[in-house]
């Protein structure tokens, strides 16, 4: 399955939108930094078969979509930007779902992939727990926004590596 070029552009657009969503100066939030322990090894495309990498990407985008679809998220961000961001993520999910179906037919996805997906889910659980602990404060959301921009950048790099493998 070849991810369309539009998928890559969508990812870049999502990053730009997320970059524009900030409402307060991040400079006031330095003390709120937190180690979410991003599972970097899950974004290393070299150790995965293509089907595995695509499912990890799908999980990453799905969890990001879920995080920004909550009521708390709606209260935190400017509505029109949030809607555009969610639309970009939704489009990417559709692209990836088509690929997952196609690729899983070609390769059997080993259990190792379940571990990778679990690692991504736990990462997002840590992010959600942090937001709860910080009572969804503006700075907590600002830290999470920076973290998601970082993880989306990792997933963009994984997509580039996947295209090079084709």
């Amino acid at each position: 399955c070849d991810l369309p070029q539009t998928h890559s552009l969508g990812n870049r657009r999502a990053l730009i939108l997320l970059g524009q969503m900030g409402r307060i100066s991040p400079f006031s939030c330095l003390k709120d930094r937190h180690d979410f322990r991003i599972p970097q090894e899950e974004f290393d495309g070299n150790q995965f078969q293509k089907a595995q990498a695509i499912s990890v990407l799908h999980e990453m985008i799905q969890q990001t979509f879920n995080l920004f679809s909550t009521e708390d998220s709606s209260a935190a961000w400017e509505q029109s930007l949030l809607e555009k961001f969610s639309t970009e993520l939704y489009q990417q999910l559709n692209d990836l779902e088509a690929c997952v179906i196609q690729e899983v037919g070609v390769e059997e996805t080993p259990l190792m992939n379940e571990d990778s997906i679990l690692a991504v889910r736990k990462y997002f659980q840590r992010i959600t727990l942090y937001l709860i602990e910080r009572k969804y404060s503006p700075c907590a959301w600002e830290v999470v926004r920076a973290e998601i921009m970082r993880s989306l950048s990792f997933s963009t790099n994984l997509q580039k590596r996947l295209r090079r493998k084709d």
Partner: antibody, heavy 121, light 107 residues
């Protein structure tokens, strides 16, 4: 390879203006903040201020607020430090360094080579 | 502003010695503390971040510890290339502040 390359040494007279630069390469320039640090001859390190190149938001140390201006041009991955009217006490080595912003990653992990500014009549 | 105080301001040691430098913050900064090494005519180099994490490429003889207000940089076995000035820096809040530096000289 991540690099921060600063402009060359400057010799200026009191009252003159100056703009020094710091060009980033080998990484996404807008994903990191750029901080400026002063080191006067034989002295320690002093943080001057910082810029987020993605939107040019800045923060200054109270000691340097109104004395210098920090700016950036993300299209050429370059940050700047400028003075409108130099004083002899501005004579120092000036360093730029990248900062990960709100991400949990090493602060000031890469530094420029420094720009020596000498202000003398 | 958060004040950072390093001690000693200078020390003399021999190759192979264990060297300890301390840094005290004027208020609690959690583990938001970095350590840098600077050699004459060179830019500072990050050694330790978030109090105890060793920066990539830095020899394991360097270690950091502490939290709250009191922090320590330890060089387990001093090497010839370690003679330099060391700075701590609080990373909790702006304005970021550095300690005054500790110069490690050859005995």
């Amino acid at each position: 390879e991540v690099q921060l390359v600063q402009s060359g040494a400057e010799v200026k007279k009191p009252g003159e203006s100056l703009k020094i630069s710091c060009k980033g390469s080998g990484y996404s320039f807008t994903s990191y903040w750029i901080g400026w640090v002063r080191q006067m001859p034989g002295k320690g390190l002093e943080w001057m201020g910082i810029i987020d190149p993605s939107d040019s938001d800045t923060a200054y140390s109270p000691s340097f607020q109104g004395q210098v201006t920090i700016s950036a041009d993300k299209s050429i991955s370059t940050a700047y430090l400028q003075w409108s009217s130099l004083k002899a006490s501005d004579t120092a080595m000036y360093y730029c360094a990248r900062h990960p912003g709100l991400n949990w990653a090493p602060d000031f992990d890469y530094w420029g080579q420094g720009t020596l500014v000498t202000v003398s009549s | 502003d958060i004040q950072m105080t390093q001690s000693p301001s200078s020390l003399s040691a021999s190759v192979g010695d264990r060297v300890t430098i301390t840094c005290r913050a004027s208020q609690s900064i959690g583990d938001f503390l970095n350590w840098y090494q600077q050699k004459p005519g060179k830019a500072p180099k990050l050694l330790i971040y978030f109090a105890s994490s060793l920066q990539s490429g830095v020899p394991s003889r360097f270690s950091g510890s502490g939290s709250g207000t009191d922090f320590t940089l330890t060089i387990s076995s001093l090497q010839p290339e370690d003679f330099a000035t060391y700075y701590c820096q609080q990373a909790l809040d702006f304005p970021l502040t550095f300690g005054q530096g500790t110069k490690v000289e050859i005995k």
